[in-house]
């Protein structure tokens, strides 16, 4: 027997090794792939080392016995049955409000006779439910509001923002959802001032004449 | 306003590869939930969806015709393309791109006539 | 896929008549979240078709009143309550529940 060649490897079973070179020396790499419905457990790649012993013990070709995760579907939320999606696992996808479920609400994990298991439908979609605009809403005074247009596609977001000096009350974003007709998802905000000073130094007013009006807001406080 | 415009060859051989453009505005595919088809009128088939478009680039395909067909879109151009490969006299037709939200096609182009012929 | 059955395949009127165009699905359209994605769509001469009837028995923006839509599971109906001139054209029914979607062959509309 040579001595200068790694031992023969052994094929496994419900999988195939490749090449299948006559040759070990030092530096040869063996790939172990499994059958269709099997996966490799341990390193696919195994390498004929100086010291003529392989880099990795041997694999093997386990059954795949769950679907991949068939991902989350924007607009939606999701049910499932059992974390790994093991066969007959379910999801269930339900589209937010304003959206419409195009394709299969459920799918179901199915086991094949060759291969891996099978999802029972390609994820969904959720949909527009309809392309009416929301009309523009007016910034808030002492605020802006971006963008400026009178008219939102429906599932357009507009942003608040307040002067300096300015504090927003409410969302800094609403949106507009999406229905019959479409609406804003909240009230617009209002920029409340961030503090009785800051109310009269952004008007440039001078507190000092107007004493009376201040001592009313000193006795107030 | 929402409008379509389709555009294509108008006469092609058999065996030949069709390509379609939609051009449109009024909307934007950019909006998240917002798709875009193609629909072709037949003497044979009558009305048949062909393909969407999402969005998100997802595409999907009517099955029967699913080997031949290649959908794709140009979202910054505000257009959307139709690739049909091996074109027969069966594919003469109408051609029509439509907006799809809600489930239906609300807003349709003007159709793009094709004629197979040798 | 689901087969949309029209009748009938031909119409013929007088202008200020009724009309009643059927439609039935192969299967139920009923969709997961509880509607019927049932549309109606008219394609006049020389044109596009249009939408004229969504959900069943929603009116489209710009549709007439004299168009409505009902019907439900398998079985629909779209009814013309006085047919004017402009109303003659070929009528398809749509389902969007199920995808592939699916058109009936048409009904057309014309003049007796």
């Known amino acids: 027997p040579r001595n200068d060649t790694c031992p023969e490897l052994p094929e496994i079973p419900n999988g195939w090794k490749s090449p299948s070179q006559p040759e070990l020396v030092h530096g040869t790499v063996v790939t172990y792939q499994c059958y269709p419905g099997y996966q490799v457990v341990g390193s696919s790649v195994l390498m004929c080392q100086w010291d003529l012993t392989w880099s990795e013990d041997l694999p093997s070709c386990q059954r795949v016995t769950s679907c991949h995760d068939p991902g989350d579907v924007e607009h939606s939320r999701r049910l499932i049955s059992s974390p790994k999606f093991p066969v007959g696992a379910t999801v269930q996808y339900i589209c937010d409000q304003g959206f419409v479920l195009m394709g299969s609400s459920i799918l179901t994990c199915h086991d094949r006779q060759a291969g891996s298991p099978k999802w029972s439908d390609r994820a969904p979609k959720c949909l527009l439910e309809q392309l009416k605009p929301c009309h523009g809403l007016s910034a808030p005074e002492n605020g802006a509001r971006s963008p400026e247009k009178q008219l939102h596609p429906a599932g357009a977001t507009i942003h608040f923002s307040c002067a300096p000096g300015y504090v927003l009350k409410g969302q800094a974003s609403i949106k507009c959802v999406p229905g019959h007709p479409s609406h804003w998802s909240d009230p617009p905000p209002i920029c409340r001032a961030a503090s009785l000073d800051g109310f009269y130094n952004s008007r440039s007013l001078d507190v000092a004449k107007a004493p009376a009006a201040s001592s009313t807001l000193d006795a107030a406080h | 306003q929402v409008t379509l415009k389709e555009s294509g060859p108008g006469i092609l051989q058999p065996s030949q590869t069709l390509s379609l453009t939609c051009s449109f505005s009024?909307?934007?595919?950019?909006?998240?939930?917002?798709?875009v088809s193609w629909i072709r009128k037949t003497s044979g088939k009558g009305l048949e969806w062909l393909a969407h478009?999402?969005?998100?680039?997802?595409?999907w395909y009517n099955p029967s015709l699913k080997s031949r067909l290649t959908i794709s879109k140009a979202t910054s151009s505000n257009q959307v393309f139709l690739i049909l490969t091996s074109v027969d006299t069966a594919d003469t037709a109408t051609y029509y791109c439509?907006?799809?939200?809600?489930?239906?096609?609300?807003?349709w182009g003007q159709g793009t006539t094709l004629t197979v012929s040798s | 896929d689901v087969v949309m059955t029209q009748s009938p395949l031909s119409l013929p009127v007088s202008l200020g008549d009724q009309a009643s165009i059927s439609c039935r699905s192969s299967q139920s359209i009923v969709h997961s979240n509880g509607n019927t994605y049932l549309e109606w769509y008219l394609q006049k001469p020389g044109q596009s078709p249009k939408l004229l009837i969504y959900?069943?028995?929603n009116r489209f923006s710009g549709v007439p009143d004299r168009f409505s839509g009902s019907g439900s599971g398998t079985d629909f109906t779209l009814k013309i309550s006085r047919v004017e001139a402009e109303d003659l054209g070929v009528y398809y029914c749509?389902?969007?529940?199920?995808?592939?979607?699916?058109f009936g062959g048409g009904t057309k509309l014309e003049i007796k």
């Open positions: 439509a907006t799809f939200y809600g489930l239906y096609f609300a807003y």
């Open positions: 478009i999402f969005w998100d680039d997802d595409k």
């Open positions: 749509f389902q969007g529940s199920h995808v592939p979607p699916t």
């Open positions: 959900k069943v028995s």
């Open positions: 009024g909307f934007s595919l950019s909006t998240s939930g917002m798709g």
